[in-house]
Interface confidence: low
């Protein structure tokens, strides 16, 4: 007759924290007579999980009635799994002996891994705004996951970023882990509506990654471009000069007109036109009475944006 | 001695079309001697799926070697599953008899359901545009899914809608099913950038729902608001009157200026300013030579938008 084999069909079982884990084990024969036991780990330091013969194992239930005649199924279920239960479990057949039963054969083992989901990633950006062409840093953090293997990717408007550094802590074995990543993002003028996304993939998420986002509008300052032009006027003794302030972000802007270096008028931009890219435009005009001037006039449009140093553009108005 | 039990551990098994289905069955004893058979359905009309003793079953393979001494595992695998294979499968033990074997005991049955994915949902909107405060209907359709259980949700800009009617056809059993839903959406002035989303969740989609979208920009017409104002002018003999045409969609717009009811100028809007909400603004101005008028002048800004009836706003210009 073929010698008894101990079959543990699953090499590995992965269970979410809080669930029950079923560890399967079957014998191929009823002979030799003797009990089975389940252990976690192998060798001298192995931990008894279940003994068919004796003992109290409140979290363990058997899948079949082990006392039943002809039973060959010695599978067990362990309830309320925590990460501390991870390890390799062995189903071991003993042969009836005197005074003690003797270990006869062991199954190949089933590795139990315990899964815990990462927390929703939190993305934070720089404390102060930066201008286009400069690099800013964003951080992403997530905690409480197990196993340790995790993938973190950064995206800007759907395009994957590559300039980032990621750490998973702790380095050694732990009940759960944390991830921290810092990405460096180069700002462009069109980034007011841009978003950075931190995407985390983990075995517990079944292919549906967690994402944390941050808006670059909180991190960017786009300085305005100025254009001063003269508009046609039907009245001969008047000139209409406009200052087009274009593509700035955020809103805060103060404009001053100077005639030959002397302040003529100061305005705070209120009714702004928003561009498709999220930046703003504003236009101010100055009506100049040419009769009041004998010589040519230099008109200067001076703009202070978001508390930064003023920029200006001048226009020479010819008095003919 | 305990009597043999036929164990079918899974109450139900769900398989995707084209996959193999494993139906598990185990006996608790080697006695009595006799073959096992698998049937679909119960009673007189049941269909033989597999007979251990005889016959040719090309799509069926056994999981264990049934001829092996002491074998108690009578699980089978059926390849290339189609929706037509759905049903309840029974593992039945027969006792050797003469001339025929006699049915001894049946397992509790395993219900095999076959999964087929729904097609990508197609969303269509109304044939003609409607204005804000009016209700428009959107339809969503998806086909070819199984089982019949399916969830359909409607969203507008991420907010779930409740005013919709959904039907799944046919009402009775079928190889596959279709879903049709009609949602009623109240338009608002800010809906140019809005989207309606039809979201379908089904067991085959592994928690990743299918979505179909439609843009409300195809369904909405936002009529303009008009404002006529006089701008300050330093030149005494001229008045600058502007007509601000605000928040209209779609683009098509023609503006006519009338002085005391007589057409002064007609313009077609070209360079428009786009607002954050997707509507457009446009401004036209009229320079009026006040010297040419002895009495007050009524200036009228008349706008025809998107082929609709014209709207107008007048301004009384005082000639002092």
């Amino acid at each position: 007759e073929d010698e008894l084999q101990v079959i543990q069909p699953e090499k590995s079982v992965s269970v979410a924290a809080g669930e029950s884990a079923t560890l399967r084990c079957a014998m191929t024969s009823l002979i030799p007579v003797g009990p089975i036991m389940w252990f976690r780990g192998a060798g001298a330091g192995r931990e008894l999980i279940y003994n068919q013969k004796e003992g109290h194992f409140p979290r363990v239930t058997t899948v079949s009635e082990l006392t039943k005649r002809n039973n060959l199924d010695f599978s067990i279920s362990i309830s309320n799994i925590t990460p501390a239960d991870a390890g390799t479990y062995y189903c071991v057949k003993f042969r009836k002996g005197s005074p003690d039963d003797v270990e006869f054969k062991s199954g190949a083992g089933t590795e139990l891994s315990v899964r815990a989901k990462p927390s929703a990633p939190v993305v934070s950006g720089p404390a102060v705004r930066a201008t286009p062409e400069h690099t800013v840093s964003f951080t992403c953090e997530s905690h409480g996951f197990s196993p340790r293997d995790i993938t973190l990717k950064w995206f800007k408007n759907g395009n994957e970023l590559s300039d980032f550094q990621t750490n998973v802590d702790p380095a050694g074995d732990s009940v759960s882990y944390s991830i921290h990543s810092t990405a460096r993002v180069v700002l462009t003028r069109g980034d007011v509506h841009s978003q950075v996304i931190c995407e985390i993939a983990h075995i517990t998420l079944q292919g549906d990654p967690l994402r944390g986002t941050a808006n670059l509008s909180e991190a960017i300052r786009v300085p305005p471009t100025l254009e001063v032009t003269q508009q046609p006027m039907r009245a001969e003794n008047q000139a209409n000069v406009t200052c087009q302030v274009s593509n700035f972000y955020p809103r805060g802007l103060q404009l001053t007109w100077l005639e030959n270096g002397n302040v003529s008028r100061t305005e705070t931009a209120s009714t702004l036109i928003e561009n498709k890219d999220g930046t703003y435009n504003w236009m101010s005009w100055l009506l100049v009475n040419t009769c009041a001037h004998r010589d040519d006039v230099v008109l200067t449009c001076q703009v202070e944006h978001d508390g930064q140093q003023a920029v200006s553009k001048s226009y020479a108005l010819e008095i003919s | 001695e305990d009597e043999l039990q036929v164990i079918q551990p899974e109450k139900s098994v769900s398989v995707a079309a084209g996959e193999s289905a494993t139906l598990r069955c185990a006996m608790t004893s080697l006695i009595p001697v006799g073959p096992i058979m698998w049937f679909r359905g119960a009673g007189a009309g049941r269909e033989l799926i597999y007979n251990q003793k005889e016959g040719h079953f090309p799509r069926v393979t056994t999981v264990s070697e049934l001829t092996k001494r002491n074998n108690l595992d009578f699980s089978i695998s059926i390849s290339n599953i189609t929706p037509a294979d759905a049903g309840t499968y029974y593992c039945v033990k027969f006792r050797k008899g003469s001339p025929d074997d006699v049915e001894f005991k049946s397992g509790a049955g395993t219900e095999l359901s076959v999964r087929a994915k729904p097609s990508a949902p197609v969303v269509s909107g109304p044939a003609v545009r409607a204005t804000p405060e009016h209700t428009v209907s959107f339809t969503c359709e998806s086909h070819g899914f199984s089982p019949r259980d399916i969830t359909l949700k409607w969203f507008k800009n991420g907010n779930e809608l409740s005013d919709f009617q959904t039907n799944v056809d046919p009402a009775g059993d079928s190889v596959s099913y279709s879903i049709h839903s009609t949602a009623r959406v109240v338009l608002t002035r800010g809906d140019v950038h809005s989207q309606v989303i039809c979201e379908i969740a089904h067991i085959t989609l592994q928690g990743d729902p299918l979505r179909g979208t439609a843009n409300l920009s195809e369904a909405i017409r936002v009529p303009p608001t008009l404002e006529v104002t006089q701008q300050p002018m330093r030149a005494e003999n001229q008045a600058n009157v502007t007509c601000q045409v605000s928040n209209f969609y779609p683009r098509g717009l023609q503006l006519t200026w009338l002085e005391n009811g007589n057409v002064s100028r007609t313009e077609t809007a070209s360079t428009l300013i786009e607002n954050k909400d997707g509507t457009y603004n446009w401004m036209s101005w009229l320079l009026v030579n006040t010297c040419a008028h002895r009495d007050d002048v009524v200036l009228t800004c008349q706008v025809e938008h998107d082929g609709q009836q014209a709207v107008s706003k007048s301004y009384a210009l005082e000639i002092s």
Epitope: K11, F164, H202, G207 | -
Partner: antibody
Framework: QIQLVQSGPELKKPGETVKISCKAS????????MHWVKQAPGKGLKWMGW????????TYVDDFKGRFAFSLEASASTAFFQINNLKNEDTATYFC??????????WGQGTTLTVSS | QIVLTQSPPIMSASPGEKVTLTCSAT???????LYWFQQKPGSSPKLWIY???NLASGVPARFSGSGSGTSYSLTISNMEPADAASYFC?????????FGGGTKLEIK
């Protein structure tokens, strides 16, 4: 232990079809993607694409769109790779490799395909 | 797509010698997604170094990896006959994933 076992060598004529299998064992098949890599004789490695073993959704590199198809039989923990309308330049060894969080940690032994008239 | 160029394509080294293989990318690659594989004739590739500098299971400590951005390298501190093989760098930082052309390392 974890293993990827591929089907045996194939000798085909131009215009024919071939289907290569890759059977996984020792881990939960649907937790890890499966990638396919081509190595022409005496040449380097070329990544062809991958299949999501949970959703069965394939992703192909531009050079391998059209005649190539990835598929699965998840219940048998097996991934497949098919080439239709074979050409001489398809002669190569094709590898399956496990993806996931540590890309390419396990590879199949390779399947040698020879296309010759 | 990111093209990975390995140099030199072929090199030979004496036992005990220090060897450095380089891998240069046409655009920046995340260090987390730069891997090295070893392949011997008639065998499938083996994961050798992952995430730029981590040795895969069973890889001798004489191997090390380093780099960032567009420039990466694999170093053997003292060459042994068992190290004779082809080494391929691989990025899966962005689609499509790509391999370098390989460096064939021979023993003198």
């Amino acid at each position: 232990q974890i293993q990827l076992v591929q089907s045996g060598p194939e000798l085909k004529k131009p215009g024919e079809t071939v289907k290569i299998s890759c059977k996984a064992s020792g881990y939960t098949f649907t937790h890890y993607s499966m990638h396919w890599v081509k190595q022409a004789p005496g040449k380097g490695l070329k990544w062809m694409g991958w299949i999501n073993t949970e959703t069965a959704e394939p992703t192909y590199v531009d050079d391998f769109k059209g005649r190539f198809a990835f598929s699965l039989e998840a219940s048998a923990s097996t991934a497949f790779f098919q080439i239709n309308n074979l050409k001489n330049e398809d002669t190569a060894t094709y590898f399956c490799a496990r993806g996931g969080l540590r890309q390419g940690d396990y590879w199949g032994q390779g399947t040698t395909l020879t296309v010759s008239s | 797509q990111i093209v990975l160029t390995q140099s030199p394509p072929i090199m030979s080294a004496s036992p005990g010698e220090k060897v450095t293989l380089t891998c240069s990318a046409t655009s920046s690659v995340s260090a987390s997604y730069l891997y090295w594989f070893q392949q011997k004739p008639g065998s499938s590739p083996k994961l050798w170094i992952y995430s730029t500098s981590n040795l895969a299971s069973g890889v001798p400590a004489r191997f090390s990896g380093s780099g960032s951005g567009t420039s990466y390298s694999l170093t053997i501190s003292n060459m042994e006959p068992a190290d004779a093989a082809s080494y391929f760098c691989h990025q899966w930082s962005s689609y499509p994933y790509t391999f370098g052309g390989g460096t064939k390392l021979e023993i003198k």
